[in-house]
């Protein structure tokens, strides 16, 4: 039994870690597997992490965290059985994926704007609380076509835009994820997505 | 309002123990991390110890490693430092703070401890 | 370890001189580094931390900035109540370590 591809492993920068790996041939990665991490130069325990199977040879393991800092560092050591198949180190706050952000809701009783509002995933002593920007995903669920996004770089979780930008008596959908560039993270998985119905007034002609 | 108080500090010969204690009002410790950081005269500032919210991580400086212990009483809403074997370079003044992401937000107002013979 | 020196080490400035301070780390830490003031015989007081947020009741004419190996801390127009000693601490890694310090004094 050997790994095949070394894992790799992002952080929420909050309790979980989760890592992933390819080992050479089928594997149940929960009963002939286990991850043990310890961190460096604190005193504390070494944890075990039972894997899932995740593709045919693939594993995953979800590694509960206490409340990750940003000096963190862990050994990791991938077993099977007495075996000591690879052994690494990970530095959570090196490796961030944000969480989604959540309670995404669209507003339309705003005088002909359409406001978006979301909540940032963090807590507000988390590091990542006052860094996040965000990226709206907003579509037609009629035209394909008609999907756009909208870059968020202030820190309020929130958008404006003028309903008529839009098309008027057509079903859309939004959804948003977040990153935090200083600390150089990965994007978040986009959070759920919301539908409204778009109505606006049109504008009377002048003559 | 947030106020944390050290006390126990004192003169202490070389190998001799003192227990420090930081009792803490404004907020819950087991909510927060807790530090002990100390300053020697004149000198500056030194991060010797620290303990995580759930008490699971705990840190210390090599220079104090297994001779200083850091504990809390979370019904008592107060940290403590143990330190044993002391030394005259652990002359210093000994600072409580309430720690967030390894940033000292609070602080007390710090207690000297003097080791000498 | 990560060692922080801090430049310069005495600064004589006048009330509403613009004062900046560099802490330059020996080897890269993103924006994990904090600022702090202390005032004789008390305990040190956070300003910034996350390398550029300013702490909730700092005034503003303090401001940080920088990543990686070189930060800086600015004061806009200095205050008498600012003549103190100012540490960086790098929050990188494992020992945490202080800068030497800088002692802003009056001219």
């Known amino acids: 039994m050997k790994v095949l591809q070394e894992p790799t492993c992002v952080s929420d920068y909050m309790s979980i870690s989760t890592c992933e790996w390819k080992m050479n041939g089928p594997t149940n990665c929960s009963t002939e597997l286990r991850l043990l991490y310890q961190l460096v130069f604190l005193l504390s325990e070494a944890h075990t992490c039972i894997p899932e199977n995740n593709g045919g040879a693939g594993c995953v393991c979800h590694l509960l965290m206490d409340d990750v800092v940003s000096a963190d560092n862990y050994t990791l050591d991938l077993w099977a059985g007495q075996q000591l198949l690879w052994k690494g180190s990970f530095k959570p706050s090196e490796h961030v994926k944000p969480r989604a952000p959540g309670n995404l809701t669209v507003h339309t009783n705003v005088s002909d704007t359409l406001l978006l509002t979301w909540s940032n995933p963090y807590p507000p002593d988390n590091y990542l609380y006052n860094h996040l920007t965000y990226a709206v995903n907003i579509w037609s669920e009629n035209d394909p076509a008609d999907f756009r996004i909208y870059n968020v770089t202030y820190l309020e979780p929130s958008l404006r835009i003028a309903a008529s930008t839009l098309k008027s008596g057509i079903s859309y959908r939004a959804r948003v994820r977040a990153w935090a560039q200083c600390y150089n993270t990965t994007w978040s998985e986009w959070s759920p997505s919301t539908k409204w119905h778009n109505s606006y007034r049109e504008p009377f002609e002048q003559h | 309002q947030v106020q944390l108080v050290e006390s126990g500090g004192g003169l202490v010969q070389p190998g001799g123990s003192l227990r420090l204690s930081c009792a803490v009002s404004g907020f819950t410790i087991s909510d927060h991390y807790m530090s002990w950081i100390r300053q020697a005269p004149g000198k500056g500032l030194e991060w010797i110890s620290y303990?995580?919210?759930?008490?699971?991580?705990?840190y210390y400086a090599d220079s104090v490693k297994g001779r200083f212990t850091i504990s809390r009483d979370n019904a008592k809403n107060s940290l403590f430092l143990q330190m044993n074997s002391l030394r005259a370079e652990d002359t210093a003044v000994y600072y409580c703070?309430?720690?967030?992401?390894?940033?000292?937000?609070?602080w007390g107002q710090g207690t000297l401890v003097t080791v000498s013979s | 370890d990560i060692q922080l020196t801090q430049s310069p080490s005495f600064l004589s400035a006048s009330v509403g001189d613009r004062v900046t301070i560099t802490c330059w780390a020996s080897?890269?830490?993103?924006?994990?580094l904090a600022w702090y003031q202390q005032k004789p015989g008390k305990a040190p007081k956070l300003l910034i931390f996350a390398a550029s947020t300013l702490q909730s009741g700092v005034p503003s004419r303090f401001s940080g900035s920088g990543s990686g190996t070189e930060f800086t801390l600015t004061i806009s127009s200095l205050q008498p109540e600012d003549f103190a000693t100012y540490y960086c601490?790098?929050?990188?890694?494992?020992?945490?370590?202080f800068g030497g310090g800088t002692k802003v004094e009056i001219r």
């Open positions: 601490q790098q929050l990188n890694s494992y020992p945490l370590t």
């Open positions: 703070a309430r720690t967030r992401q390894l940033v000292g937000d609070y």
């Open positions: 080897q890269g830490i993103s924006s994990y």
């Open positions: 303990i995580s919210s759930s008490g699971s991580k705990i």
